[in-house]
């Protein structure tokens, strides 16, 4: 695959996981009521990391938001924290990516500076796509430790007239917003990889110039207007310069121009 | 405003069928369960089911299942209750009711007196 | 099922008096995502259809008179009528709105005294 097309995968990539993120950032069901093995209740109760809802069967829904910090679980403001980090980190990287893609011409930005801002957005969506990762899994292995709790104190008996009355409690399980989670991670995780292998492609290597050095010292180089254009690439028209695969050639030029491959 | 009109009285033969209807208006009939429920002659309130006009769901009581079928017709913003092998205790005023907050039944049908008898 | 007894099965008070029908449930009908009762009231008059009063324990339908009132919570729940009318004479239920099927207790006939 070449350069362009494995650093351009490689944002589209990360730019569908970063929307997922964001998505499953938002998603209110992130945990959902279990119905399995439960008195079918006419209520569907669902939780966010933001609100908490409930949708009875009238159609009727109420939501509520967690206007509290200080009474949430530590878990769940971790689990808000590495979210809120993975989507900050994208945006810097998608924000990074864009000025480093090889199809978008900035000023007179060379192939090495595009080469590390393409390691760098790579770096950050890696890094993005582990937090949102490790969010997700950590609110599922939070809600596995409560769904067994809840089931070995699944009816809790409560003394009253005519004897025992029965409390039903609440069970939660996974809910849509873990598994658009988990994909969007690893959307993300693998976009930033893609990146990072695209920057390798793009990082000039110095036996490439030695190579093309070699060559235009070894022949008549034939003047033309524009100094060693033809030869070396490197003529006092830069205007349209571009760096393939670290050989030296230019795009407004037709003839063959040597790369390193010509010297193997 | 909002209105469940159903049909008529019946008088049945024990073994046989009836259709109740229930035409709703003045709301949007696919967003709204409707439930059905029935009171035997000096007797209290029994809720049989209920269906999702939008989507054709359904859900029994489990004492009425085999005995009732809920449908819907969202053309005609119409419920049906079909009771089959009608026997005398069967007899009863049968309600449309539709569903509000709280899942509450806050509009009525004026209810069918159905009349199981041979 | 979910079972739903009102007591008593018969009331009767003065004009102006304050009458009281309970309402116990088999199951809690509080829900925990919402903390909310699922619990309706209804009256019902000879020859008529029920009429919805309280929804969520204690919530008030508009346009039922303020003298209604729900309270309770879990399994115990309360219809109270502050200053009886004579309109006010009929059969009351309540209702499980929680778990299906949804139940409707006996029913308190209330008459005026």
């Known amino acids: 695959m070449s350069v362009t097309a494995c650093q351009g995968l490689g944002f589209v990539v990360s730019l569908i996981g970063f929307a997922g993120i964001i998505a499953a950032t938002c998603m209110d069901q992130w945990s959902t009521q279990d119905l399995y093995n439960n008195p079918v209740t006419a209520v569907f109760n669902y939780q966010g990391l933001w609100r908490s809802c409930v949708r009875e069967s009238s159609g009727f829904t109420e939501c509520r938001g967690y206007f509290t910090l200080l009474g949430l679980p530590a878990m769940l403001q971790a689990v808000r924290a590495l979210m809120i980090v993975g989507i900050v980190l994208g945006v810097i990287g998608i924000l990074v990516s864009i000025f480093a893609l090889k199809c978008i011409r900035i000023g007179s930005m060379d192939d090495s500076a595009k080469a590390k801002m393409t390691l760098t957005s790579g770096i950050l969506f890696i890094i993005s796509g582990i937090c949102a990762i490790i969010g997700v899994s950590v609110f599922a292995n939070m809600l596995v430790t409560n769904f067994w709790m809840s089931t070995a104190n699944m009816y809790s008996g409560m003394g009253g007239m005519g004897g025992m009355v029965q409390t039903v409690q609440t069970r939660y399980t996974f809910g849509a917003a873990l598994f658009v989670g988990w994909v969007a991670g690893g959307l993300t995780l693998i976009g930033g990889v893609m990146m990072c292998i695209a920057c390798r492609g793009l990082t000039p290597d110095d036996s490439n110039f030695k190579a093309v050095s070699y060559h235009a010292s070894g022949q008549n180089v034939a003047y033309r207007p524009g100094g060693f254009k033809a030869s070396t690439g490197f003529g006092s028209n830069t205007r349209n310069k571009k760096i393939y695969d670290g050989g030296a050639r230019t795009e407004d030029d037709e003839q063959s121009h040597p790369t390193k491959y010509d010297y193997v | 405003q909002v209105q469940l009109v159903q049909s008529g009285a019946e008088v049945k033969k024990p073994g046989s069928s009836v259709k109740v209807s229930c035409k709703a208006s003045?709301?949007?009939?696919?967003?709204?369960?409707i439930e059905w429920v029935r009171q035997a002659p000096g007797q209290g309130l029994e809720w049989m089911g209920l269906i999702n006009p939008g989507s054709g769901g359904t859900n029994y009581n489990e004492k009425f299942k085999g005995k009732v079928t809920i449908t819907a017709d969202k053309s005609t913003s119409t419920a049906y209750m079909e009771l089959s092998s009608l026997r005398s205790e069967d007899t009863a005023v049968y309600y449309c009711?539709?569903?509000?907050?709280?899942?509450?039944?806050?509009?009525w049908g004026q209810g069918t007196l159905v009349t199981v008898s041979s | 099922d979910i079972v739903m007894t009102q007591s008593p099965d018969s009331l009767a008070v003065s004009l102006g008096e304050r009458a009281t029908i309970n309402c116990k449930s088999s199951?809690?009908?509080?829900?925990?995502?919402?903390?909310?009762?699922?619990l309706a009231w209804y009256q019902q008059k000879p020859g008529q259809p029920p009429k919805l009063l309280i929804y969520?324990?204690?919530t008030r339908e508009s346009g039922v008179p303020d003298r209604f009132s729900g309270s309770g919570s879990g399994t115990d729940f309360t219809l109270t009528i502050s200053s009886l009318q004579a309109e006010d004479v009929a059969v009351y239920y309540c209702q499980n709105d929680y778990f299906y099927p949804f139940t409707f207790g006996q029913g308190t006939k209330l008459e005026i005294k």
């Open positions: 009711a539709r569903v509000y907050y709280g899942n509450s039944f806050a509009y």
């Open positions: 003045g709301y949007a009939f696919s967003n709204y369960l």
């Open positions: 969520w324990a204690s």
């Open positions: 199951q809690s009908l509080l829900n925990s995502g919402n903390n909310k009762n699922y």
